[in-house]
C-alpha cells in the first residue's frame, strides 16, 4: 500500500506563438482545479476507461480575474498535493491523465459552470520510494509543469511497496532471516502476519493468514517434525497424521513467472528471472520502449525500439539519472553571497539571505542605520546586518531611550558608596581607601601607595568620577 503524489507547479501559456486567451474575465471570474487519473501498466489512456489505480481531485484554486489587455499569465493554483492512495503493490509502470478544469463563478443559474481547459496524458516508469520526478506536458497552447512520486505507507517498503518493515528489536541486527530495510537501516523487514500460532522457526507465509512449512516440518502450524524413514519423496507439504513427507506442490510448480520468466525456489518462496524487457516479482511488468516516452525533462531516447532492447536516455544539460529525472545539484556552485542559503526549486535557484542582506543572490548589504535614529545624542553603528546604537553618557538601551543608572554596575570598590550625578557618578569611599572608584588603599601614615589625593580633597571624601 502507498500513495501516489502529484504536485502541480504551474499552468499557463506554453512557449511559442499563439498564446491562449485567459480563461477568466472581469465579467466571468473563475478558478482552476485539477483531476488526476492513474492506470497500471502501459494501458491506453482513453479518458473513459476506469482509473484502476485510483483518481483524485484537487481543491479549488484562488479566484482569478483577467487584467484587461494583459497576456494570460501562469494561473493561480490550488494549494497542496493531489494524493492517490493505492492499496496493492505499486505496478512500476503506469499511465496518467491530468485534467485542468475551469470553474466559472459568474451569475449562472444553478451554480458554477465547469469546463475542461486542458488534458495531458502519458505513460511512465516509476519506482516507489524514489525522488520527485519532474515533467512538462503541453496541451494545445497551454503548458502544465508538475512533479510526481510514489511512496509506500508504513510498514510497506521497496520499489513496489510489497516488503514490510518494522522497528528493530535489537539495536545491532535484525532477527534470523530478516534483512535491514533499505533505506531505513534502523528498521528490519517484517515477516507477513501468518496464521495465528504458525511456528516462527519452521513456518512462513506469502499471504496473510497462511502457514506453509519449511522442509522437515509439517502440521497446520508447522510444529510437527517430519519422520522421513518410511518416505520416498524428499520434499513437499506433509501429512500431519503420518508425519511423512509426500510429494506436494512446490513454490515453482505451475511456474508463477509470466512472460517466459524462469522460476527458482528460495528457502521461503520463489524468485523469477525475467527475460529482457520484463520485470517485477512475477515478470508481469512489460518493458518500456522509447515509444513510451521514458525520458523526462527533454531527454533524448535512443534504442529501445522494442521491449527486448534496452533504451538509453541522453539527458540535456542540468539533468541526469537513467530517465533524466534527477536535477544536477546546482547549489554546489554556492551562488548565494554573504552566507545566504541556496535552494534549488527546480525552475529556479533561490537564496535565503541572512539578516541584513537582500537581493536575489543576497548581494545587497542593507543599510541598517537608514531610517533609524538613536535618541538622546546616540550614534548608529552598522554591523553584521543588525543596527546598534552607541549611546551618550547616561543613556542606554537599544535606541538610547532609557536613562542609564551609572551605579547599576557597582563601580565603587572596597565598599564605597555610589551616587548618581548629572555628568556621571561619584564614589564616597570607605575609610582607608581613596581614588575615583575607591581603588587605592591609604597607608596608615596618610600617604597613598599610588597618586596622592588632589589638593583640598582628604582621603575618605567623595571622589567624583567624570
Amino acid at each position: 500500500a502507498g500513495v501516489f503524489e502529484l504536485q502541480i507547479h504551474s499552468f499557463g501559456p506554453g512557449p511559442g506563438p499563439g498564446a491562449p486567451r485567459s480563461p477568466c474575465s472581469a465579467r466571468l471570474p473563475c478558478r482552476l482545479f485539477f483531476r488526476v487519473c492513474l492506470k497500471p501498466g502501459l494501458s491506453e489512456e482513453a479518458a473513459e476507461s476506469p482509473c484502476a489505480l485510483g483518481a483524485a481531485l484537487s481543491a479549488r484554486g484562488p479566484v482569478y480575474t483577467e487584467q484587461p489587455g494583459a497576456p494570460a499569465p501562469d494561473l493561480p493554483l490550488p494549494d497542496g498535493l493531489l494524493q492517490v492512495p493505492f492499496r496493492d503493490a505499486w505496478p512500476g509502470t503506469f499511465s496518467f491523465i491530468i485534467e485542468t478544469w475551469r470553474e466559472e463563478l459568474g451569475d449562472q443559474i444553478g451554480g458554477p459552470a465547469w469546463s475542461l481547459l486542458a488534458r495531458v496524458a502519458g505513460r511512465r516508469r516509476l519506482a516507489a520510494g524514489g525522488p520527485w520526478a519532474r515533467d512538462i506536458q503541453r496541451a494545445g497552447a497551454w503548458e502544465l509543469r508538475f512533479s510526481y512520486r510514489a511512496r509506500c505507507e508504513p510498514p510497506a517498503v521497496g520499489t513496489a511497496c510489497t516488503r514490510l518493515c518494522r522497528p528493530r528489536s535489537a539495536p545491532s541486527r535484525c532477527g534470523p532471516g530478516l534483512r535491514p530495510c533499505a533505506p531505513l537501516e534502523d528498521e528490519c523487514e517484517a515477516p507477513l502476519v501468518c496464521r495465528a500460532g504458525c511456528s516462527p522457526e519452521h513456518g512462513f507465509c506469502e499471504q496473510p493468514g497462511e502457514c506453509r512449512c519449511l522442509e522437515g516440518w509439517t502440521g497446520p502450524l508447522c510444529t510437527v517434525p517430519v519422520s522421513t524413514s518410511s518416505c520416498l519423496s524428499p520434499r513437499g507439504p506433509s501429512s500431519a497424521t503420518t508425519g511423512c513427507l509426500v510429494p506436494g506442490p512446490g513454490p515453482c510448480d505451475g511456474n508463477p513467472c509470466a512472460n517466459g520468466g524462469s522460476c527458482s525456489e528460495t528457502p521461503r518462496s520463489f524468485e523469477c528471472t525475467c527475460p529482457r524487457g520484463f520485470y517485477g516479482l512475477r515478470c508481469e511488468v512489460s518493458g518500456v520502449t522509447c515509444a513510451d516516452g521514458p525520458c523526462f525533462n527533454g531527454g533524448l531516447c535512443v534504442g529501445g525500439a522494442d521491449p527486448d532492447s534496452a533504451y538509453i536516455c541522453h539527458c540535456p544539460p542540468g539533468f541526469q539519472g537513467s530517465n533524466c529525472e534527477k536535477r544536477v545539484d546546482r547549489c554546489s556552485l554556492q551562488p548565494c553571497r554573504n552566507g545566504g542559503l541556496c535552494l534549488d526549486l527546480g525552475h529556479a535557484l533561490r537564496c535565503r539571505c541572512r539578516a541584513g542582506f537582500a537581493g536575489p543572490r543576497c548581494e545587497h548589504d542593507l543599510d541598517d542605520c537608514a531610517g533609524r535614529a538613536c535618541a538622546n545624542g546616540g550614534t548608529c553603528v552598522e554591523g553584521g546586518g543588525a543596527h546598534r546604537c552607541s549611546c551618550a553618557l547616561g543613556f542606554g538601551g537599544r535606541d538610547c531611550r532609557e536613562r542609564a543608572d551609572p551605579c547599576a554596575a557597582r563601580p565603587c570598590a572596597h565598599g564605597g558608596r555610589c551616587y548618581a550625578h548629572f555628568s556621571g557618578l561619584v564614589c564616597a569611599c570607605a575609610p582607608g581607601y581613596m581614588g575615583a572608584r575607591c581603588e587605592f588603599p591609604v597607608h596608615p601614615d596618610g600617604a597613598s601607595a599610588l597618586p596622592a589625593a588632589p589638593p583640598g580633597l582628604r582621603p575618605g571624601d567623595p571622589q567624583r568620577y567624570l
Epitope: L333, Q334, R337, R361
Partner: nanobody
Amino acid sequence: EVQLVESGGGEVQPGGSLRLSCAASGSIFSSNAMGWYRQAPGKQRELVAGFTGDTNTIYAESVKGRFTISRDNAKNTVYLQMSSLRAEDTAVYYCAADVQLFSRDYEFYWGQGTLVTVKP
C-alpha cells in the same frame, strides 16, 4: 539568450595537461558564480571547480592541487587548467554559470560540454 561555449577538450595521456575555456555571451549583466562540472559515463554530474557567489574558489577533493580555475571578468570567461591528469578524470566537462541578465533576473546556464579523455 545566453550561451556558454566550451573549448579545449581532447585526448591526453596520463600525467598530461589541458586547458578548458568557457566563454559566456548574450544579454549578461554580470556573471555571479561560474565553474566546471563533469560527468563520467554512468556517474552523477559533480562539481569540479568554481567561483562561488562570494568569489571564493572551490575545488572537488579529487582535483585539489592538480586543477586551477581562473576567470577573466572583462571577457566573461572562465578557465580550467588541468595538470597531472589521470584516467579517472575522463568525463564530459560542462561549464556552468549563474548569470544575472539585464532584466536583473538570475538564470543558471549550462554549456553543451566538452569531452576530456585520458588514456595511455
